[in-house]
């Protein structure tokens, strides 16, 4: 089929970075600059993205790909293919319509984007706080209080806060 | 908050140039480019130029030979400059903060060009 | 230069219906659409970004969808405060350039 194809039409021996001609008896021409054609056989070359302003370039358009756009430093994108760049803050802080504030007592933000989210509630699950949280991190939570009553476990004793990935075995 | 505040003149007079200070608050302009756009009345939107943080400038060529954009980062100003205008220019103009998208606009200044 | 052409011009709805407004793009410019609503008198408030993503505060009526060529601005109850001015745009390449506007009015 595809030998059959090529017979019938011409456009389909042009490769990418290429395009079938239609102003040349359909001869493979290159993409002409700033444009670019990721697959063969393509009647014409699509013109390749610019990246301006508040977006840098990331990879450069070749005659066989488009162009990626992402932020300049002090921004992150928003959708899928960086449409829109927003400012970062810091940890410990979210992005309001009056700029970079910090997380309120009881949230936290540990990334430079996104919203300040709450604290886990560690007794929801039966536990206890082992480390306390912060405006850039969350809490740790630890062993539930019955686990540390006096008694409890005669042969380790619990782990110290200082250590909040150690659990007594 | 992010503003952009506009100040400029109502009427121009044919041949004369238009002359538009955007005053922005609640960001810097060392960080953010600004762009211009204008919208005659009951039409679309169109593109016209842009300054950038550091200061380059782009323009949309049907304007290039008529259009200045400057920018004071202290005063955290841009000017907008057309020359030569024409009855067809009858337009409101916008300036705008340049986010990749434009989701910050000013109020608009209505300009018309009439005798 | 790329030119949008939005359909239809204008168009009159009832309060609860639902509307679909398109945008077709001369050129392939990927996801890279934006819509806007203006209301009188007022300056254009972004709705969507990259073709699908709702803007912060954006009610979740409204819905962007399409890629290429091919682009839609869906607006599934419409409420009497939603009647405005449509406008699409690309951002993708400059000069960037806007479609003619769809008006939606109140039938």
């Known amino acids: 089929f595809e030998r059959t194809r090529s017979l019938q039409d011409p456009c389909s021996n042009c490769p990418a970075g290429t395009f079938c001609d239609n102003n040349r008896n359909q001869i493979c021409s290159p993409c002409p600059p700033n444009s670019f054609s990721s697959a063969g056989g393509q009647r014409t070359c699509d013109i390749c993205r610019q990246c301006k302003g508040v977006f840098r370039t990331r990879k450069e358009c070749s005659s066989t790909s488009n162009a990626e756009c992402d932020c300049t430093p002090g921004f992150h994108c928003l959708g899928a293919g960086c449409s829109m760049c927003e400012q970062d803050c810091k940890q410990g802080q979210e992005l309001t319509k009056k700029g970079c504030k910090d997380c309120c007592f009881g949230t936290f933000n540990d990334q430079k984007r996104g919203i300040c989210r709450p604290w886990t509630n560690c007794s929801l699950d039966g536990k206890s706080v082992l480390v306390n949280g912060t405006k850039e991190r969350d809490v740790v939570c630890g062993p539930s209080p019955a686990d540390l009553s006096p008694g409890a476990s005669s042969v380790t004793p619990p782990a110290p806060a200082r250590e909040p990935g150690h659990s007594p075995q | 908050q992010v503003q952009l505040k506009q100040s400029g003149p109502g009427l121009v007079q044919p041949s004369q140039s238009l002359s538009i200070t955007c005053t922005v608050s609640?960001?810097?302009?060392?960080?953010?480019?600004v762009h211009w756009v204008r919208q005659p009345r009951g039409k679309g939107l169109e593109w016209l130029g842009a300054?950038?943080?550091?200061?380059?400038?782009d323009y949309n060529a049907a304007f290039i030979s008529r259009l200045s954009i400057t920018k004071d980062n202290s005063k955290s100003q841009i000017f907008f400059k057309m020359d030569s205008l024409k009855a067809d220019d009858t337009a409101i103009y916008y300036c705008?903060?340049?986010?990749?998208?434009?989701?910050?606009w000013g109020q608009g200044t209505l300009v018309a060009v009439s005798a | 230069n790329i030119v949008m052409t939005q359909s239809p011009k204008s168009m009159s709805m009832s309060v609860g219906e639902r509307v679909t407004l398109r945008c077709k793009a001369s050129?392939?410019?990927?996801?890279?659409v934006s819509w806007y609503q203006q209301k009188p008198e007022q300056s254009p408030k972004l709705l969507i970004h990259?073709?699908?993503n709702r803007y912060t505060g954006v009610p979740d009526r409204f819905t962007g969808s399409g890629s290429a060529t091919d682009f839609t601005l869906t607006i599934s109850n419409v409420q009497a405060e939603d009647l405005a001015d449509y406008h699409c745009?690309?951002?993708?390449?400059?000069?960037?350039?806007f479609g003619a506007g769809t008006r939606l009015e109140l039938k």
């Open positions: 745009g690309q951002t993708y390449s400059y000069p960037l350039t």
């Open positions: 300054i950038w943080s550091g200061g380059s400038t």
């Open positions: 705008v903060r340049d986010d990749g998208s434009f989701a910050n």
């Open positions: 990259g073709a699908s």
């Open positions: 609640g960001f810097s302009l060392t960080t953010y480019g």
């Open positions: 050129e392939n410019v990927g996801t890279y």
